[in-house]
């Protein structure tokens, strides 16, 4: 069995250089501890953005350092990520483990796009 | 190392040059002349752990982030335990993309 | 995996299979090399993307059950064994590997 990973193609991010988008795992087994990690594709270079472990029915916490936040619902995870400039523009890959009860199973989503455009700066005012 | 059959064993992987507790870590082995067997692995901050049914009750997978060190205890080992053990890195992407040189466990009496 | 043993010429192509005895995601395969003495080395994962610094003469392709890696010329260096692993579920397994041999 496989797990299968959805999530959005394209997403924008906002003014303030915040995106958000839907993961959504299709769960071969019953897990109580899930695992997501956002990972950012660039080129060959793949790097961790990211990651939260939690128990089903419980609310994600990622490290107070974090640049993500998240909330969870079934087998629906809903991930922010701040603080993004121009040059954050990438593919955001979502990755999902079921880490328990075994066995493990691992999903990967086929990224999503996201595009950020720094806000022009405000012309000085006389 | 050469240690008797019922004896016991560590074996200890020291990693380098990523994020250590951002992977999964492997423990493979290879009998001498046969093909990779997987072990054990040992999940990000070591609360998760899965070994294969040959050696589950008998090996006990550990790590210290700190200092990046992946452990393998090993006890009442027998002769088929004999073989080279490797560590491995679980990529970001699931596949052991970088291994150690591997270490020559040798049980017998 | 097959077959056991390939015997090859340098420049000649190489073909090797590795079936799973059930389907599984594309997505989790992966190919390694071992050379005589060595630890393995990751060649392809996600059955057809190759690893960081792996020469363009390999390639993996397949799906469900039946995957291929193909080494389009061979290099003496190549000469090695091969194992198959699926990674996307517990127990990690492979293949029992295939030798490429020099005829």
């Known amino acids: 069995k496989a797990m299968h990973v959805a999530q959005p193609a394209v997403v924008l991010a906002n003014s303030r250089g915040t995106a958000s988008f839907v993961c959504e795992y299709a769960s071969p087994g019953k897990a109580t501890e899930v695992r997501v990690t956002v990972l950012r594709q660039a080129d060959s270079q793949v790097t961790e953005v990211c990651a939260a472990t939690y128990m089903m029915g419980n609310e994600l916490t990622f490290l107070d350092d974090s640049i993500c936040t998240g909330t969870s619902s079934g087998n629906q995870v809903n991930l922010t990520i701040q603080g993004l400039r121009a040059m954050d523009t990438g593919l955001y890959i979502c990755k999902v483990e079921l880490m328990y009860p075994p066995p493990y199973y691992m999903g990967i989503g086929n990224g999503t796009q996201i595009y950020v455009i720094d806000p022009e700066p405000c012309p000085d005012s006389d | 190392g050469v240690v008797q059959p019922g004896r016991s064993l560590r074996l200890s992987c020291v990693a380098s040059?990523?994020?250590?507790?951002?992977?999964?870590m492997h423990w493979v082995r290879q009998a001498p002349g046969k093909g990779l067997e997987w072990v054990a692995v040992?999940?990000?901050?070591?609360?998760?752990?899965y070994y294969a049914d040959s050696v589950k009750g008998r090996f006990t997978i550990s790590r210290d982030n700190s200092k990046n060190t992946l452990f393998l205890q090993m006890n009442s080992l027998r002769a088929e335990d004999t073989a080279v053990y490797y560590c491995?890195?679980?990529?970001?992407?699931?596949?052991?993309?970088?291994w150690g040189q591997g270490t020559l466990v040798t049980v017998s009496s | 995996q097959s077959p056991g043993t390939l015997s090859l010429s340098p420049g000649e192509r190489a073909t090797l299979s590795c079936r799973a005895s059930q389907s599984i995601s594309s997505s989790f395969l992966a190919w390694y090399q071992q050379r005589p003495g060595q630890a393995p080395r990751l060649l392809i994962y996600?059955?057809?993307s190759r690893a960081t610094g792996i020469p363009d003469r390999f390639s993996g392709s397949g799906s469900g059950t039946d995957f291929t890696l193909t080494i389009s010329r061979l290099e003496p260096e190549d000469f090695a064994v091969y194992y198959c692993?699926?990674?996307?579920?517990?127990?990690?397994?492979f293949g029992q590997g295939t030798k490429v041999e020099i005829k």
């Open positions: 692993q699926q990674y996307g579920t517990s127990p990690w397994t």
């Open positions: 040992i999940w990000y901050d070591g609360r998760n752990k």
């Open positions: 491995a890195r679980g990529g970001h992407f699931g596949p052991f993309d970088y």
């Open positions: 996600g059955a057809s």
């Open positions: 040059g990523f994020t250590f507790s951002s992977h999964g």
